[in-house]
Interface confidence: low
Amino acid sequence: AGSDNPYVPCAPSPCVNGGTCRQTGDFTFECSCLPGFEGSTCERNIDDCPNHRCQNGGVCVDGVNTYNCRCPPQWTGQFCTEDVDECLLQPNACQNGGTCTNRNGGYGCVCVNGWSGDDCSENIDDCAFASCTPGSTCIDRVASFSCMCPEGKAGLLCHLDDACISNPCHKGALCDTNPLNGHYICTCPQGYKGADCTEDVDECAMTNSNPCEHAGKCVNTDGAFHCECLKGYAGPRCEMDINECHSDPCQNDATCLDKIGGFTCLCMPGFKGVHCEIEINEGNSGLNDIFEAQKIEWHENLYFQGHHHHHHHH
């Protein structure tokens, strides 16, 4: 006999935790579980912790198709293999003015004023077997040590003379000492190169493009360069177009038009000349005079300005 609400195995789905239901018969179903789950309805989270990878006392916490390691305080990372820096967490870990150095699974102290031991509270010399040159300071590290050199000494064991003492780097360059061979290394300031920073960098030959804009001429100088600008341009790199109209060169109420490297005056009726300074009686055409002014401007533009002229561009 039929029923108004016949049983459909997958409606609603009995599968939990994201499992997919598949009808296998009139009254039967099968759950296809997401990774990490098992059981007839995917109700069980598979334990991912057997033979886990947590180390250094890390506790395995099962997740969905994964696990996490809950690490002890001195370890971190996915498997508790990465060291925590206790020196950051415990500012007073070392007593008696000792310096804290981080170690795998803990920390160590580099002590001062005769103090020694794990926390600088006892008299054990951590650097007893170090071979730092006398006069240098030994700092204990994880399974090793480092030597802090006095002035004039360099190298991993402070056994080399510091080549920077003689100030071999010129032009205010920064001098560093190679810890392996004691040789100096100069970090040159802008504009200089070479082992001693004595060679000038020719900025004009350096790049494919001219550092001076608007066809300015690049002139190399010691440690730098400067630009000789075409008429009508100014600025350290000839980047500014000078507004020649700024000085109001046109007379008799004429209109000034700024041009590249020059200007043109559009005269009021009855005036002519480059600056509209000439009064005319007859109604002559002023066009020829305008062309003349432009011709002058064009010829002047062919020459370089000898020096920088600092104009204000508006």
Epitope: N51, R53, Q55, N68, G77, Q78, F79, T81, G105
Partner: antibody, heavy 117, light 112 residues
Framework: QVQLQQSGAELAKSGSSVKISCKAS????????IHWIKQTTGQAPEWTGY????????KFNEKFKGKATLTVDKSSTTAYMQLSSLTPVDTAVYYC??????????WGQGTLVTVSS | DVLMTQTPVSLPVSLGGQVSISCRSS???????????LHWFLQKPGQSPQLLIY???NRFSGVPDRFSGSGSGTDFTLKISRVEPEDLGVYYC?????????FGGGTKVEIK
């Protein structure tokens, strides 16, 4: 510095077993997992399994369960992998590698195992 | 197992040129701890693989800065900015987010 020194090449017959070693130095042996990785000529490496030296706990790639046995000797800081019931498909270079940063940070030079039928 | 797919399989390069190798995973490599455990290795002919980049973009000690790693989720890239002769060999990606750890098939970088 960290070093993993592996034993020399092995030539074995089908059905037999071999035991290869990986001597660790330059770090605290108990603090880091030792992995074993198989690489057949011209193929990508394949993770086989690992051992936690501190506890002796192991975990294997399903593919290698029953094939490999991993052990350590903490006193000599040496890890071992024994391969049993050898067949020609076990012919490969086997590497040991140290764990760190969730990856294999340092590798041994590899041990070539050749299985003849 | 997570499938790691590397492209291209072979990459002819010119010395001084730039190289880009892709690695795709069949599922997201973001671990529940927030980290992404995707790493890159180089295996030079006749040598063991060596770690170059760990957790997507961190250069391992001693690895030159011409090597860089990027990506997220399932898509990752290794770039070499200026190829040098010692960079030739097979590059592998590795995931260690999901058990078991799985390597990509490799990309052979060779001279054109």
């Amino acid at each position: 510095q960290v070093q993993l020194q592996q034993s020399g090449a092995e030539l074995a017959k089908s059905g037999s077993s071999v035991k290869i070693s990986c001597k660790a130095s330059g770090y605290t042996f108990s603090n880091y997992v030792i992995h074993w990785i198989k690489q057949t000529t011209g193929q990508a490496p394949e993770w086989t399994g690992y051992i936690i030296p501190g506890s002796g706990g192991t975990k294997f790639n399903e593919k290698f369960k029953g094939k490999a046995t991993l052990t350590v000797d903490k006193s000599s800081t040496t890890a071992y992998m024994q391969l049993s019931s050898l067949t020609p498909v076990d012919t490969a270079v086997y590497y040991c590698a140290r764990d760190g940063a969730g990856s294999f940070t340092y590798w041994g030079q590899g041990t070539l195992v050749t299985v003849s039928s | 197992d997570v499938l790691m797919t590397q492209t291209p399989v072979s990459l002819p390069v010119s010395l001084g040129g730039q190289v880009s190798i892709s690695c795709r995973s069949s599922q997201s490599l973001v671990h529940s701890d927030g980290n992404t455990y995707l790493h890159w290795f180089l295996q030079k002919p006749g040598q063991s693989p060596q770690l170059l980049i760990y957790r997507i973009s961190n250069r391992f000690s001693g690895v030159p800065d011409r090597f860089s790693g990027s990506g997220s989720g399932t898509d990752f890239t290794l770039k070499i900015s200026r190829v040098e002769p010692e960079d030739l060999g097979v590059y592998y990606c590795l995931q260690s987010t999901h058990f078991p750890d799985t390597f990509g098939g490799g990309t052979k970088v060779e001279i054109k």
